[in-house]
Interface confidence: low
């Protein structure tokens, strides 16, 4: 990070950057490097792509070491072949309403995701796809055996547990928070983001957190038992310290990671939580970053291409972590 030292570049020749990635001078004006892209970790030495209007957002003033590449206010979004202005809302399909915010797209479901408990007037609710309707709707089945009504009602509660939370309605603000996106890296330290308006003034904002689905150095396939095809959540032998651009977590963590499969399925986090992690850097500086911690993983065939950032809106969501991290504030 320190620019006071003599320039030392990793390679004599300029690196070959992937299509659409700019070749830029590092922050010290020394070496030509491939610019970091939206949502990637950035440092003084690893700058963000200026041609896409990105800047390195270091977050908290104290964290001047490592940031996340963020689009400047007002950057447009490209989604499904169309360009949308920052602040513009659109429907990606009949089921999702999306908003472009500074280069990132956040989508919220238009179809009700409610869970319907049995009630006296609807003892056997069932969701069905009706012709000509986009969203599935609840229908009430008559029980074949009238005596079945009794046990079904055991789950019924007077309060509508799954109704909208009135404490989140503020000044006509319908609070909406997208699920956390998939981790930007399949192994090693990456970034996961979401869009929310769950803040005092109902403003859309992006939140980010560090994430690690699995360590890169782990050879997890070796641990798959004979006859099995997957190891969903491998046991971690010893507590680990996380590393982030030369800085090391102050505490050790007995973290859960996701395993691997040998049958073409991929294992991704299913339930997660977000906790602050303090990192100590070689110069003694301490910085605090929010990080995803895995509770459970799921193995499935929905393995979108790693470069398709939008597929993660549909396939690789992470649940169980909608509470404000301070949120985020």
């Amino acid at each position: 990070q320190d620019c006071s030292a003599q320039c030392q570049c990793a390679a004599e020749a300029a690196p070959h950057c992937p299509a659409g990635v700019s070749l830029v001078l590092d922050g010290c004006g020394c070496c030509r490097v491939c610019a970091k892209q939206l949502g990637e970790l950035c440092t003084e030495r690893d700058p963000c792509d200026p041609h896409k209007g990105l800047f390195c957002d270091f977050g908290s003033p104290a964290n001047r070491k490592i940031g996340v590449c963020t689009a400047k206010d007002g950057a447009p979004c490209v989604f499904g072949g169309s360009v949308y202005r920052s602040g513009e809302s659109f429907q990606s399909s009949c089921k999702y309403q999306c908003t472009c915010l500074d280069g990132a797209v956040g989508c919220v479901p238009l179809c009700s995701m409610d869970v319907r408990l049995p009630s006296p007037d609807c003892p056997f609710p069932r969701r069905v796809k009706l012709p000509g309707k986009c969203c599935e709707e609840w229908v009430c089945d008559e029980p074949k055996d009238r005596t079945a009504v009794g046990p079904a009602l055991a789950a019924y509660r007077l309060e509508d547990t799954f109704g909208p939370d009135p404490t989140m309605m503020r000044a006509n603000c319908l609070v909406q928070t997208t699920e956390w996106s998939a981790c930007s890296k399949t192994c090693g330290m990456g970034i996961s983001t979401r869009v929310t308006n769950d803040n005092t003034f109902c403003r859309l904002e992006k939140q980010s957190r560090l994430c690690m689905v699995r360590p890169c150095e782990a050879d997890l396939e070796e641990n798959i038992k004979k006859g099995k095809k997957c190891i969903r959540t491998p046991k971690i032998a010893k507590p680990v310290k996380f590393e982030l651009s030369g800085c090391t977590s102050v505490k050790t963590y007995r973290a859960k990671f996701c395993g691997v499969c040998t049958d073409g399925r991929c294992c991704t986090p299913h339930r997660t939580t977000t906790l602050p992690v303090e990192f100590k850097c070689p110069d003694g500086e301490i910085m605090k970053k929010n990080m995803m911690f895995i509770k459970t993983c799921a193995c499935h065939y929905n393995c979108p291409g790693d470069n398709d950032i939008f597929e993660s809106l549909y396939y690789r969501k992470m649940y169980g972590d909608m509470a404000h991290h301070h949120h985020h504030h």
Partner: antibody, heavy 114, light 110 residues
Framework: EVTLKESGPVLVKPTETLTLTCTVS????????VHWIRQPPGKGLEWLGV???????DYNAAFMSRLTISKDTSKSQVVFTMTNMDPVDTATYYC????????WGQGTTVTVSS | ESVVTQPPSVSGAPGQRVTISCRSS?????????ANWVQQLPGTAFKGLIG???NRAPGVPDRFSGSKSGTSASLAITGLQAEDEADYYC?????????FGGGTKLTVLG
């Protein structure tokens, strides 16, 4: 009508722990967060910490190791605890509602002296 | 560490327009700093005027407005009145904490 009222000891000895309570009315602690701010005599405001409506907390880094903020939503009370008090902590302590710091308590003056 | 700077004092005659600046030491003020403005009338409690850069608190007259530009947030008061004489504080949010400015004493002349 929205009101916040701080209560607690007026005098605290050095090294002792200060515990203040902010009792609110006119709104629910599950709808709004509550901040704690202090003002030393003749000086400006210093933000100490906040408990958000969902119970999460953020603290001023300078007081992180000494400060705890908790709440009892059913009693409409927020409790502020600061350990290891020092004469430099002599100030008027305020609680204020989140949402643009729109409503404040009257403040309680705390003197730290042996 | 972030420092938030306000002018110690400003003054204006009744009916005039005054602005109070609130400068962030660590770069541009953005919507994510949720600039807040608080008024302390002499001998009375505090009252929130503006939150989220430009949102007026309930009951605050539209003579008070908030904005941001570059590294500063600003509070503007138009049609200055004698009862506006008070101390004004800004507060900026930095990801995990608020920082208050040192306060500005507004004197209404005449």
């Amino acid at each position: 009508e929205v009101t916040l009222k701080e209560s607690g000891p007026v005098l605290v000895k050095p090294t002792e722990t200060l515990t203040l309570t902010c009792t609110v009315s006119g709104f629910s602690l599950s709808t709004f967060g509550v901040h704690w701010i202090r003002q030393p005599p003749g000086k400006g405001l210093e933000w100490l910490g906040v408990i958000w409506r969902r119970g999460g907390t953020d603290y001023n880094a300078a007081f992180m190791s000494r400060l705890t903020i908790s709440k009892d939503t059913s009693k409409s009370q927020v409790v502020f605890t600061m350990t290891n008090m020092d004469p430099v902590d002599t100030a008027t302590y305020y609680c204020a509602r989140d949402g643009g710091f729109d409503y404040w308590g009257q403040g309680t003056t705390v003197t730290v002296s042996s | 560490e972030s420092v938030v700077t306000q002018p110690p004092s400003v003054s204006g005659a009744p009916g005039q327009r005054v602005t109070i600046s609130c400068r962030s030491s660590i770069g541009a003020v953005t919507t994510s700093n949720y600039a807040n403005w608080v008024q302390q009338l002499p001998g009375t409690a505090f009252k929130g005027l503006i939150g989220g850069t430009s949102n007026r608190a309930p009951g605050v007259p539209d003579r008070f407005s908030g904005s941001k530009s570059g590294t500063s947030a600003s509070l503007a008061i138009t049609g200055l009145q004698a009862e506006d004489e008070a101390d004004y504080y800004c507060a900026l949010w930095y990801s995990t904490h608020y920082v208050f400015g040192g306060g500005t004493k507004l004197t209404v002349l005449g």
